[in-house]
């Protein structure tokens, strides 16, 4: 994750008291919440591995970087960070590994400067479509988010309540077109089987997209055409078998792109010919010399760049009358 780490050397720590105590008064400028460490010089508050069950109410107004990792938050309600006066400086919020399973509509409202949000390593079974947009309007006010880190947010399979997890995440990314300014999106390690076809077209500012360590089998219906700013596309450790001509042409047409394709089970048959030709010519694939065949068995571990058209054959399909059991 690219969330900032504090360079603060002078953290003040408050005396511990009930972590979920609610303060009716606005916080004093130099106040530090219970079970947290604060550095006004670094504009940083760290409430890390303290088993907090709610977001502290008395966060100092100066906070720019807020770490709430390794807690027991469970739920982020609407306005979880809304304060009077607002946390107008908060730019980076890290909530990773805090056992969140529910993020409600408007959870991040009233954070006008929030640029980086990390929700990784939380089993988000219930992510509201309006978690990031804050409203159910067809077009919402633009979110200030530039980086959204959602690695390993998939709940256990038996906890997905018969809903498409991919669909739930994408609904939150697209609601109200609020994330038009998003530049980095990380969705690694989420067991994604597919990428809904409309998602990338509606995130036109993306520079970095990480889809590594998922279960993507195909990119046939995914269009990269509009992502003219895309600089890195991580597709390592998926279940990709081949990239077809349309995808190859779109990737080649992106002016700044670097693509990462390692550790996919490439099927080296006649359908792979176009991809092999493209790999030999393109400069966009990083570590292309490491790509190897997984299937068929006779081709296992062959390097894609070393294949020629004679290597890439498809077994003829016998008519039913000639097939033997």
């Amino acid at each position: 994750s690219s969330s900032p780490t504090s360079s603060a050397s002078s953290f003040s720590s408050s005396a511990p008291f009930l972590a979920s105590a609610v303060s009716a008064q606005p916080p004093l400028p130099d106040q530090c919440p219970a079970l947290c460490e604060c550095s006004e010089a670094a504009r940083t508050v760290k409430c890390v591995n303290r088993n907090l069950t709610e977001v502290p109410t008395d966060l100092p107004a100066y906070v720019r970087n807020l770490f709430l990792t390794g807690n027991q938050l469970a739920v982020l309600p609407a306005g979880a960070f809304a304060r009077r006066p607002p946390l107008a400086e908060l730019a980076a919020l890290n909530l990773s590994g805090s056992r969140l399973d529910e993020v409600r509509a408007g959870a991040f409202e009233h954070l006008p400067s929030l640029r980086q949000l990390d929700l990784s390593h939380n089993p988000l079974a219930d992510l509201s479509p309006f978690a990031f947009s804050g409203s159910n309007a067809s077009v919402s006010a633009p979110s200030p988010l530039v980086e959204l880190i959602l690695n390993h947010i998939v709940p256990p399979e038996d906890e997905r309540q018969n809903r498409s997890f991919e669909g739930m995440v994408v609904a939150a990314l697209l609601a109200g077109r609020a994330l038009q300014g998003l530049r980095r999106l990380e969705l690694a390690s989420n067991h994604f089987l597919y990428l809904p076809r409309d998602v990338l077209a509606q995130l036109p500012s993306l520079r970095h997209l990480d889809l590594s360590n998922n279960s993507l089998v195909s990119l046939t219906y995914v269009s990269f055409r509009n992502l003219t700013h895309l600089e890195s596309l991580h597709l390592e450790d998926n279940a990709l078998k081949v990239l077809h001509n349309g995808t190859l042409a779109e990737l080649q047409g992106l002016p700044h792109i670097r693509v990462f394709l390692d550790n996919n089970p490439w099927v080296c048959d006649c359908h792979m010919a176009d991809m092999v030709t493209w790999l030999k010519e393109t400069e966009v694939v990083q570590g292309k010399d490491r790509l190897t065949c997984a299937y068929p068995e006779k081709m296992r571990n062959r390097v894609l760049l070393e294949l020629n058209s004679a290597d890439l054959d498809c077994d003829p399909i016998l008519p039913p009358s000639l097939q033997t059991s």
């Epitope: 027991q72 938050l73 739920v75 805090s98 939380n122 219930d126 709940p155």
Partner: nanobody, 122 residues
């Protein structure tokens, strides 16, 4: 409506341990949190501990932190309360509850068991 059945109560000496169980008749998908409350004679029912079915987040009232541990077995639709270093003031009827919220209030929970009595005395 979910049926919640508590078991495991009994009499124990100060410093001893007990494990309470709460079995749900079915997995209450509409209830995201399972909790234990207790009610001592002549006192109000008070929150003890809670756990989330999915994320496994836990929370405790201050007086039991470090002594009690709440856990769950999703496959068995069962929640447990391991109680150690028991004190006389832990004597109460212990109730299992299920609800939507991540709260400590009685009103956060819609489904309740009948309770199991825990008595701590020399």
């Amino acid at each position: 409506e979910v049926q919640l059945v508590e078991s495991g109560g009994g009499e124990v000496q100060p410093g001893g341990s007990l494990r309470l169980s709460c079995a749900a008749s079915r997995r209450p998908f509409s209830s995201k949190t399972m909790a234990w409350f207790r009610q001592a004679p002549g006192k109000e029912r008070e929150f003890v501990a809670a756990v989330r079915w999915i994320g496994g987040a836990t929370r405790y009232t201050d007086s039991v932190k470090g002594r009690f541990s709440i856990s769950k077995d999703n496959a068995k639709n069962t929640v447990y309360l391991q109680m150690s270093s028991l004190r006389a003031e832990d004597t109460a009827v212990y109730y299992c509850a299920a609800g939507q919220a991540w709260g400590t209030k009685f009103t956060d929970y819609s489904d309740w068991g009948q309770g199991t009595l825990v008595t701590v005395k020399p």
